[in-house]
Interface confidence: low
């Protein structure tokens, strides 16, 4: 004969556990129903009556099957440097993420606690590592034969144009200026080479290299806002 299906509340067999979406109530010593997401336990079960659930109030939620007496409060409204990517509902917390041009300097379980603007690399420096949702831009000095003339969190160092006749040689922050009317744009096809090896880059002393990596977030946060890294600008 098939085993009888027990209805909550019921006393579990010794050594067994309650079924899915049930919990063991220590006071009643019974397996009782959990409340569904979006609800909470208004009245706990007894030996003769099951859990009474009620809907979460406004600005509160429960995301999981539960038997909590009160719903959790949704997080505070998103700050000006954030966008709300998930609204507060009875079943889910509000999630705030950083708006474009910012990254999450301090995350929380879901979303971001503290956003910070992406570093901008100043002229003479290019982006060596793009910013992500959770990490800042890393700037690097432009290697010989390359330049960046912008203050940007996205621009990388670009090759100087190759001139038939050079009017003004290029440097790390400026493209070469040609006297001829038809410069060969950035390294003639078939003559492209990788950047010079690291050993020769050290001869390229202008601009002064910045640290190759941004300080870790753990360094930054306790000390408050940090000055921009060399080769970068805070704005």
């Amino acid at each position: 004969l098939p085993a009888q299906v027990a209805f909550t509340p019921y006393a579990p067999e010794p050594g067994s556990t309650c079924r899915l979406r049930e919990y063991y109530d220590q006071t009643a010593q019974m397996c009782c129903s959990k409340c569904s997401p979006g609800q909470h336990a208004k009245v706990f079960c007894t030996k003769t009556s099951d859990t009474v659930c009620d809907s979460c109030e406004d600005s509160t939620y429960t995301q999981l099957w539960n038997w909590v007496p009160e719903c959790l409060s949704c997080g505070s409204r998103c700050s000006s440097d954030q966008v709300e990517t998930q609204a507060c509902t009875r079943e889910q917390n509000r999630i705030c993420t950083c708006r474009p041009g910012w990254y999450c300097a301090l995350s929380k379980q879901e979303g971001c606690r503290l956003c910070a603007p992406l570093r901008k690399c100043r002229p003479g420096f290019g982006v060596a590592r793009p910013g992500t949702e959770t990490s800042d831009v890393v700037c690097k000095p432009c290697a010989p034969g390359t330049f960046s003339n912008t203050t940007s969190s996205t621009d990388i160092c670009r090759p100087h144009q190759i001139c038939n006749v050079v009017a003004i040689p290029g440097n790390a922050s400026m493209d070469a200026v040609c006297t001829s009317t038809s410069p060969t744009r950035s390294m003639a096809p078939g003559a492209v080479h990788l950047p010079q090896p690291v050993s020769t880059r050290s001869q390229h002393t202008q601009p002064t290299p910045e640290p190759s990596t941004a300080p870790s977030t753990s360094f930054l946060l306790p000390m408050g806002p940090s000055p921009p890294a060399e080769g970068s600008t805070g704005d």
Epitope: T132, R158, T213
Partner: antibody
Framework: EVQLQESGPGLVAPSQSLSITCTVS????????VHWVRQPPGKGLEWLVV???????TYNSALKSRLSISKDNSKSQVFLKMNSLQTDDTAMYYC?????????????WGQGTTVTVSS | DIVLTQSPSLMSASPGEKVTMTCSAS?????MYWYQQKPRSSPKPWIY???NLASGVPARFSGSGSGTSYSLTISSMEVEDAATYYC?????????FGSGTKLEIK
């Protein structure tokens, strides 16, 4: 001469984890980052993760919960671990060097290691 | 995520023919990178910073574009150019690849 060489188990059972090693030579992991990219049979390339020269990491958010990357600079090795493999994780897994000056995202690639997920 | 859409997915060209393939980004990217891959081989960097040829790439290749629209052109197709070409961006993570354009010889 710059070289990257992947090594892995070849065959992995579903729900099990995968560990692959990329051994590099001709450059230092303290100066260059290393990416992992995979390619399912007959399909395109999918970027997975990079470990940068300073040890920082950037993950493909769609796979982040299943991926872990680390490295041993002294042994010139980068390690990729992937959990809970399914049959659609069957692919050629490549490691590739990141050119830190931003010329190429990936300027040298390994030959790849074939990973088959099957029971 | 930035989605890169390559077209056509498959094309064939005769030797000497001009070939153009495109890569369209779902949002603006600063530069495009291209890789060439032949069967049973690893991808090779082919074009970087949108328009610069990697070492050893023949001068018949060129790249162009900006914003969301990029292209790779071969001025005169040769047998050795038959391969799959992938575009790739690293303006924002994940550093996505296009689905590839397979170029066959007629």
């Amino acid at each position: 001469e710059v070289q990257l060489q992947e090594s892995g188990p070849g065959l992995v059972a579903p729900s099990q984890s995968l560990s692959i090693t990329c051994t590099v030579s001709g450059f230092s992991l303290t100066s260059y980052g290393v990416h992992w990219v995979r390619q399912p049979p007959g399909k395109g390339l999918e970027w997975l993760v990079v470990i940068w020269s300073d040890g920082g990491t950037t993950y493909n958010s769609a796979l982040k919960s299943r991926l872990s990357i680390s490295k041993d600079n002294s042994k010139s090795q980068v390690f990729l671990k992937m959990n809970s493999l399914q049959t659609d994780d069957t692919a050629m897994y490549y490691c590739a060097r990141h050119d830190d000056d931003g010329y190429y995202a990936m300027d040298y690639w390994g030959q790849g290691t074939t990973v088959t997920v099957s029971s | 995520d930035i989605v890169l859409t390559q077209s056509p997915s498959l094309m064939s060209a005769s030797p000497g023919e001009k070939v153009t393939m495109t890569c369209s980004a779902s949002s603006s990217v600063g530069y495009m990178y291209w890789y060439q891959q032949k069967p049973r081989s690893s991808p090779k960097p082919w074009i970087y910073l949108t328009s610069n040829l990697a070492s050893g790439v023949p001068a018949r290749f060129s790249g162009s574009g900006s914003g969301t629209s990029y292209s790779l052109t071969i001025s005169s197709m040769e047998v050795e150019d038959a391969a799959t070409y992938y575009c790739q961006q690293w303006s924002s993570d994940p550093f996505t690849f296009g689905s590839g354009t397979k170029l066959e010889i007629k």
